[in-house]
Amino acid sequence: FERTRSLQDPCSNCPAGTFCDNNRNQICSPCPPNSFSSAGGQRTCDICRQCKGVFRTRKECSSTSNAECDCTPGFHCLGAGCSMCEQDCKQGQELTKKGCKDCCFGTFNDQKRGICRPWTNCSLDGKSVLVNGTKERDVVCGPSPADLSPGASSVTPPAPAREPGHSPQ
């Protein structure tokens, strides 16, 4: 089948990084500078993405793959392939459509993106508050109030581990 197809369509023999040049009797020509073809048999090469302004180059364009962009410091990616850069806020803030604003009492944000999250309600799991929450940190729940009766052994809170962090989008 492959051989039959290539007899019918000489372009199918052109590998990635080349294009089938109709102006040169369907010869496979290399992609010109600043362009690429990621699959074989293409009749044109695609223009490389340029990472300008708030975008910065994460991976250079090659003849067989497009450039990849991420965001300059102070911004983060949104959308497939980092189609947009959005400004970071500080921890303890959320980005509204009017800019960064502090988390309201009872909420926190330990990230530089996203919105403020309500503090954990320790009592719902039968626990007590060991460390109060702040704008930047959730409350830390301790043992249940019954465990804190006189004579009960004190509980040493665990060393803080890394809080949930960013996922590459």
Epitope: C103, Q111, G114, C116, W119, D138, C141, A161, P164, S167
Partner: antibody
Framework: QVQLVQSGAEVKKPGASVKVSCKAS????????MHWVRQAPGQGLEWMGW????????NYAQKFQGRVTITRDTSISTAYMELSRLRSDDTAVYYC?????????????WGQGTLVTVSS | YVLTQPPSVSVAPGETARITCGGD??????VHWYQKKPDQAPVLVVY???YRPSGIPERISGSNSGNTATLTLSRVEAGDEADYYC????????????FGGGTQLIIL
């Protein structure tokens, strides 16, 4: 690749409890909040609660407070959702879903779902 | 915290479907959309109003302003037939996660 694999279907009697598990792989389990969402037959999606696997901190929808408990075992990268005092209208498919690293974005990976049937 | 969706939207193949999600000042929130097919887990198709995760086709887009968010599917195909849900996160401790009632997209 990220995968969330849930425990199998359960049949329970009214008043009983059910505990559904969700085993995560392909990423750092402690680094991402896990949510639970359910869908009853012929109904829409309903958010139940979340857990921070790192701290164990939770939050539950008011409707389920007092009946739902979400826990985790970081040593085996597994989250659990236990629902008590089951009623017939708790018959639903229960899903775990991962938050993508910050609050306010969409849930990017979902388990395959666990059917819980409550019937006498 | 109520998100209102039409129960169903019907569209012919190749046409454009628009599914709305209404809520008080929803334009100030970040809206996410999920596709749900029978016996399958939901799939995130648009997040934070208008961004597509990797693997979601460009013909799916979202917008959000005022009291209405909209999911738009252009050049609709038979495989797009599914239920679609909007969703918003709030900073309230009692109702952090809210879904709309869902819209069945029917391909004529």
């Amino acid at each position: 690749q990220v995968q969330l694999v849930q425990s199998g279907a359960e049949v329970k009697k009214p008043g009983a409890s059910v505990k559904v598990s969700c085993k995560a792989s392909g990423y750092n389990f402690s680094g991402y909040y896990m949510h639970w969402v359910r869908q009853a037959p012929g109904q829409g999606l309903e958010w139940m609660g979340w857990i921070n696997p790192n701290s164990g901190g939770t939050n539950y929808a008011q409707k389920f407070q007092g009946r739902v408990t979400i826990t985790r075992d970081t040593s085996i990268s597994t989250a659990y959702m236990e629902l008590s005092r089951l009623r017939s209208d708790d018959t639903a498919v229960y899903y775990c879903a991962r938050e993508p690293g910050y609050y306010g974005s969409g849930l990017d990976y979902w388990g395959q779902g666990t059917l819980v049937t409550v019937s006498s | 915290y109520v998100l209102t969706q039409p129960p169903s939207v019907s569209v012919a193949p190749g046409e454009t479907a628009r599914i709305t999600c209404g809520g008080d000042d929803i334009g100030d929130k970040r809206v996410h959309w999920y596709q749900k097919k029978p016996d399958q887990a939901p799939v995130l198709v648009v997040y934070e109003d208008r961004y597509r995760p990797s693997g979601i086709p460009e013909r799916i887009s979202g917008s959000n302003s005022g009291n209405t968010a909209t999911l738009t599917l252009s050049r609709v195909e038979a495989g797009d037939e599914a239920d679609y849900y909007c969703q918003v996160w709030y900073s309230s401790p009692d109702h952090p996660g809210v879904f709309g009632g869902g819209t069945q997209l029917i391909i004529l």
